[in-house]
């Protein structure tokens, strides 16, 4: 089950070719793998990557170009992801998620 995350709905508008940053607020005890998803209208949610919160390693889903996304936690309660070289097809709702067990 999804857990340990505190949602904070935000809307971001950026020009194509620019970058955007998304923040995930983590509740106490969120450790292990944190996943980033993109949900676009009319499509199933797509996992983009997952992040090992201990070693700060990023594992991209196949087909995701290296350097498109980067994520890092400067505190244990906050995870940030940057999206680079934005195109129209990057539009959608981005989610972070983690699971117990």
């Amino acid at each position: 089950k999804s857990s340990n995350l505190e949602g904070r709905t935000k809307s971001v508008i950026r020009q194509t070719g620019s970058s955007a940053e998304i923040t995930c607020d983590l509740a106490e005890g969120s450790t292990g793998y944190i996943h980033w998803y993109l949900h676009q209208e009319g499509k199933a949610p797509q996992r983009l990557l997952y992040y090992d919160s201990y070693t700060s390693s990023v594992v991209l889903e196949s087909g995701i170009s290296p350097g498109k996304y980067d994520t890092y936690g400067s505190t244990r309660k906050n995870l940030r992801m940057i999206l680079r070289n934005l195109i129209e097809n990057d539009s959608g709702v981005y989610y972070c998620a983690t699971w117990d067990g």
Epitope: E28, Y54, T55, S56, V58, D70, T75
Partner: antibody, heavy 116, light 107 residues
Framework: EVQLVESGGGLVQPGGSLRLSCAAS????????MNWVRQAPGKGLEWVSS????????YYADSVKGRFTISRDNSKNTLYLQMNSLRAEDTAVYYC?????????WGQGTLVTVSS | DIQMTQSPSSLSASVGDRVTITCQAS??????LNWYQQKPGKAPKLLIY???NLETGVPSRFSGSGSGTDFTLTISSLQPEDFATYFC?????????FGQGTKVDIK
Amino acid sequence: EVQLVESGGGLVQPGGSLRLSCAASGFTFSSYSMNWVRQAPGKGLEWVSSISSSSSYIYYADSVKGRFTISRDNSKNTLYLQMNSLRAEDTAVYYCARGGWLYDYWGQGTLVTVSS
Amino acid sequence: DIQMTQSPSSLSASVGDRVTITCQASQDISNYLNWYQQKPGKAPKLLIYDASNLETGVPSRFSGSGSGTDFTLTISSLQPEDFATYFCQQSYSTPQTFGQGTKVDIK
């Protein structure tokens, strides 16, 4: 086997510059955040700088901010630390370390001595 | 920045002794505390992460406990290879900071 090998240390005069390198092997370097940690002779450990996997997020200790620059070349599996305006208090063994909230692999270190 | 204070700074013990090292944070860091072992001329080695989780390959005689501001590393039965310096590190926020170290030597 994960290996981190630092190089580039040596003796430099105050105000001088050095560039440290850390060659990584045995893991997917481009997926990991990396760090520099230093240890002055006979002293404790001091975190110096961190860089995220694609270099988007970079952090420095206040003691080196504006003088040191961390960077990485994922195509060469190498981490760098450019050190400018060196001071006597920068004398230390410099380690590169893999990880974020924990440092699970460390190099053997390279000694930087700042002295006239 | 979060300050980490270790005690004692050094201790003498014999093989087979139970050894306890403490680490205190200047503010609440939940359980985000790691312990490292360092032998002379070598790089530090991760022993315990998030206060009580044993790193893979680390002997079970090492254990960690604590939460908030007060933490403990315990070696249940000291072995010859355990004579080293031990450091705590908070991983609650950047900059991650280390304790000053505790040197464990032979009595």
